[in-house]
Interface confidence: low
């Protein structure tokens, strides 16, 4: 087993929102489960964007998951990872 | 059974300070964003502050930032609310409450039988 | 700020009648409203989350609609049990605002 590494970015969109993208890369094997969460708890799928699990050429696998969100409230949400019975989360930069 | 139980209201003159404390069973504490909130003597209610579960995250109405610190202790089960330069308008009754978590997303699904806070000199 | 605007602040209805409450978002909210029932002398409980949800033990003659800026709750077959103070509360961002209350009685 090879754990994610996980890392999140932002950038500036529409109307006062920012898009958020959680990126995760390195991992084996491929089954992860990668989302993001508002106030500790999952948004619904029809917010989130899912980038498929490509393999990254060493063996390894990457994906991302992207959300839209009102500039102000970057505190409010983490993404999640699982992977292999280990989970983590990850704050949106400042 | 979830429960929520107030504690630590009175009557306080103004510019005094006040611990609240909510003690919670019946659920896994850590789990969920904890909540206070008051109704004012006109039964209007008025969000007050938010604290995250693991990741400590507060948030606070802009009538008490500054003065008013939530707290949290996982290990005890406890939620608490410090409230300090009271004012006349910080006179209430005051809840606690539980954070909806993945089974009401964005509520507030569980109150306690608050604590009456009652600013006057 | 996001402001909740509440309508009516009071009604009254016969039993039986079918009610609706609507609650007003100044901002898109989304989904992220709920409803709140506080009868006189107890605490608010939990009716509806996320617009359209019954929470548990609720009676289905509750309801809720709405999505973006617009919500109502509705409650059909008034019961003497649902004599109360109705509230809604978005959920959207900070800081969470509540509605100003609409007081239910019966004619």
């Known amino acids: 087993t090879v754990p994610p590494m996980v890392n999140v970015t932002r950038s500036e969109a529409s109307e006062g929102n920012i898009t958020v993208t959680c990126r995760a890369s390195g991992f084996y094997p491929w089954n992860i489960t990668l989302s993001w969460r508002q106030d500790g708890v999952s948004l619904s799928h029809d917010t989130q964007q899912w980038g498929d699990v490509l393999p990254d050429g060493n063996g390894t696998y990457q994906t991302w998951v992207a959300t839209r969100i009102c500039q102000g409230e970057e505190q409010r949400f983490t993404c999640y990872m699982e992977h292999s019975g280990n989970h983590s989360t990850h704050p949106v930069p400042s | 059974e979830v429960q929520l139980v107030e504690s630590g209201g009175g009557l306080v003159k103004p510019g005094g300070s006040l611990k609240l404390s909510c003690a919670a069973s019946g659920f896994t504490f850590s789990d969920y964003y904890m909540y206070w909130v008051r109704q004012t003597p006109e039964k209007r209610l008025e969000w007050v502050a938010t604290?995250?579960?693991?990741?400590?995250?507060?948030y606070y109405s802009d009538s008490v930032r500054g003065r008013f610190t939530i707290s949290r202790d996982n290990a005890e089960n406890t939620l608490y609310l410090q409230m300090s330069s009271l004012k006349s308008e910080d006179t209430a009754m005051y809840y606690c409450?539980?954070?909806?978590?993945?089974?009401?997303?964005?509520?507030?699904?569980?109150w306690g039988q608050g604590t009456s806070v009652t600013v006057s000199s | 700020d996001i402001q909740m605007n509440q309508s009516p602040s009071s009604l009254s209805a016969s039993l039986g009648d079918t009610i609706t409450i609507t609650c007003h978002a100044s901002?898109?909210?989304?989904?992220?409203l709920s409803w709140y029932q506080q009868k006189p002398g107890n605490i608010p409980k939990l009716l509806i989350y996320?617009?359209?949800h019954l929470h548990t033990g609720v009676p289905s003659r509750f309801s809720g609609r709405g999505s973006g800026t617009g919500f109502t709750l509705t409650i059909s077959s008034l019961q003497p049990e649902d004599i109360a103070t109705y509230y809604c509360?978005?959920?959207?961002?900070?800081?969470?605002?509540f509605g100003s209350g609409t007081k239910v009685e019966i004619k």
């Open positions: 901002q898109n909210i989304h989904v992220w």
């Open positions: 604290i995250s579960d693991g990741i400590t995250y507060t």
């Open positions: 996320g617009a359209s």
């Open positions: 409450s539980k954070g909806g978590g993945s089974t009401a997303r964005g509520a507030l699904d569980f």
């Open positions: 509360l978005q959920g959207q961002s900070y800081p969470l605002t």
